[in-house]
């Protein structure tokens, strides 16, 4: 901590664990640097925390232009892909499915949380490039809280979807009452309320501080600062990583065990093929979550325990880990929406608005064929549906 930090109840540059979206939120994981190299170290030599601060305290040693461009390119790609993918998912769901099924309600909530999380990246990028927070105190509070809020909401929704699928397979009768649109909405509201447990305190703790010519958007902690700072890190680690990994792994594991245990009297080859596809999907979903979130959580823990010299490699790897966390928000639309058969059907309608008309004409033609040539009805229609049908069981669970 910088010993000149003030009257003792404020920690300007400490970095409680980053937002659950692994984001470099202005007040979160990030420790932004000047690009021009003419900066002093406003945080002082003794600062602690994740990136050096839960503020966007400029780092000692400015990054080279190559480093800056690399980091900005990384953030820009993640931001554009994340916003485009998630807004597209939300639009298609609202426009074409009207939020009528539990699955679509979960996917919409996931896309909303992920879109909001990635929307903080432009602010963090500007902060990184300028080495100061130019957006004012209100936006500082909003951006940091959105970052934490939506990291948690996104992760809680992923957990909810794994529980939902587990219930569908292992408790099919309960699923009839549980998997309703009304219940899905209630569960989503509960997820947002749970996320408030960290989102609201962070909003109150976030503030801007003037430090030697630059402005930091930072979290302030009551004394003893080390206690509150580490408590936040531990909470984020447990509730945004350990617990979700356990829930997702256990739910999908039990689901696959249940499906494996089923004995078929006929169609066992199809069962095996379906099971392989579902297992593959589950492995991808779990692996993507772990790959995206492990690096930043490990990094945060290491930085909390030991002092890491600030080199170019350290800066780039830090920002890469942050970007990986946001990458999870980019991949969620692909894993949960674009691979879902129902969503794909709506998406095709969005891309080719005339498809429903063609389908209606086809079905009219098929009905005509059936009356004239009953034996060919299946063949004719199966050709029309072939592509759609082959995808069905391949979809990762909705």
């Amino acid at each position: 901590m910088d010993s000149s930090a003030g009257p003792g109840n404020i920690s300007d540059c400490s970095d409680p664990l980053a937002p659950a979206s692994c984001s470099p939120a202005p007040g979160s994981w990030l420790n932004l640097s000047h690009v021009d190299g003419n900066q002093s170290d406003p945080c002082g030599p003794n600062r602690t925390g994740l990136g050096g601060s839960h503020s966007l305290c400029p780092q000692t040693g400015s990054p080279s232009m190559v480093t800056a461009i690399t980091i900005m390119a990384l953030y820009s790609i993640v931001c554009v892909v994340g916003l485009f993918g998630n807004f597209l998912v939300m639009y298609v769901i609202v426009r074409y499915t009207k939020m009528k099924t539990a699955t679509n309600i979960y996917i919409f909530n996931l896309a909303l949380a992920d879109a909001l999380a990635t929307s903080t990246l432009p602010f963090q990028s500007v902060n990184y490039l300028m080495g100061t927070w130019p957006f004012g105190n209100i936006l500082c509070k909003i951006v940091i809280s959105i970052d934490y809020y939506n990291m948690f909401t996104s992760i809680f929704t992923l957990c909810t979807m794994s529980v939902d699928r587990y219930i569908a397979v292992c408790h099919p009768v309960k699923a009839l009452d549980f998997r309703t649109p009304r219940n899905a909405k209630i569960v989503n509201v509960c997820n947002w309320i749970l996320s408030s447990a960290i989102g609201l305190p962070v909003m109150f703790m976030a503030t801007t501080k003037y430090r030697q010519g630059s402005i930091d958007c930072t979290l302030t902690f009551s004394h003893p600062t080390w206690y509150w700072e580490n408590l936040l890190k531990i909470c984020v680690f447990i509730f945004a990583f350990i617990m979700p990994v356990l829930i997702i792994t256990v739910c999908y594991g039990l689901m696959i065990l249940r499906l494996k245990s089923v004995r078929m009297l006929s169609g066992s080859k199809e069962k095996d093929r379906n099971l392989r596809r579902i297992t593959r999907m589950v492995l991808v979903v779990v692996a993507v979550f772990i790959v995206c979130w492990t690096p930043i959580h490990i990094y945060v823990i290491i930085k909390a325990l030991i002092t890491i010299p600030e080199t170019t490699f350290q800066t780039v790897s830090w920002h890469f880990c942050i970007a990986l966390g946001y990458t999870n928000s980019c991949l969620n639309p692909v894993l949960y929406a674009f691979l879902d058969e129902n969503f794909k059907r709506c998406f095709r309608e969005f891309c080719i608005p005339t498809s429903s008309t063609i389908e209606q004409q086809n079905s009219a033609r098929i009905r005509q064929n059936t009356r004239e040539h009953p034996s060919t009805a299946n063949t004719v229609d199966r050709t029309n549906h072939q592509l759609e049908n082959l995808e069905a069981e391949t979809a990762p669970l909705p």
Partner: nanobody, 122 residues
Framework: QVQLVESGGGLVRPGGSLRLSCVDS??????MGWFRRAPGKEREFVAS????????TYADSVADRFTTSRDVANNTLYLQMNSLKHEDTAVYYC?????????????????WGQGTQVTVSS
């Protein structure tokens, strides 16, 4: 030969609920679906579900009121119908199809149950 046997139909008041069941004697891994035929109308898609029971699809008219699930261990397909309306009156059929995914077209389904009557009337 796959045999599908539906049960659970009956007379119910508007706004009431009913749960239909369909037992698959062959324990197939085929995708399955529910269809209905109202008097004087074409057979209409209601819902379909993959073998795993994870991925249900619904007709727009019932999506916010009906829920389908599949018990793979007991080879039973369910349809929970809530907030029933007069226009839900129909014979409800359970169907299974060769394993190439879900479909909302009745022509894609190879095996059919005998149907169970659902009447919504005050």
């Amino acid at each position: 030969q796959v045999q599908l046997v539906e049960s659970g139909g009956g007379l119910v008041r508007p706004g009431g609920s009913l749960r239909l069941s369909c037992v698959d004697s062959e324990r197939t891994s085929y995708p399955m679906g529910w269809f209905r035929r109202a008097p004087g109308k074409e057979r209409e898609f209601v819902a379909s579900i993959t073998w795993s029971g994870i991925d249900p699809t619904y007709a727009d008219s019932v999506a916010d009121r009906f829920t389908t699930s599949r018990d793979v261990a007991n080879n039973t397909l369910y349809l929970q119908m809530n907030s029933l309306k007069h226009e839900d009156t129909a014979v409800y059929y359970c169907a299974a199809r060769a394993p190439v995914g879900q479909s909302s077209s009745p022509y894609d389904y190879d095996y059919w149950g005998q149907g169970t009557q659902v009447t919504v009337s005050s």
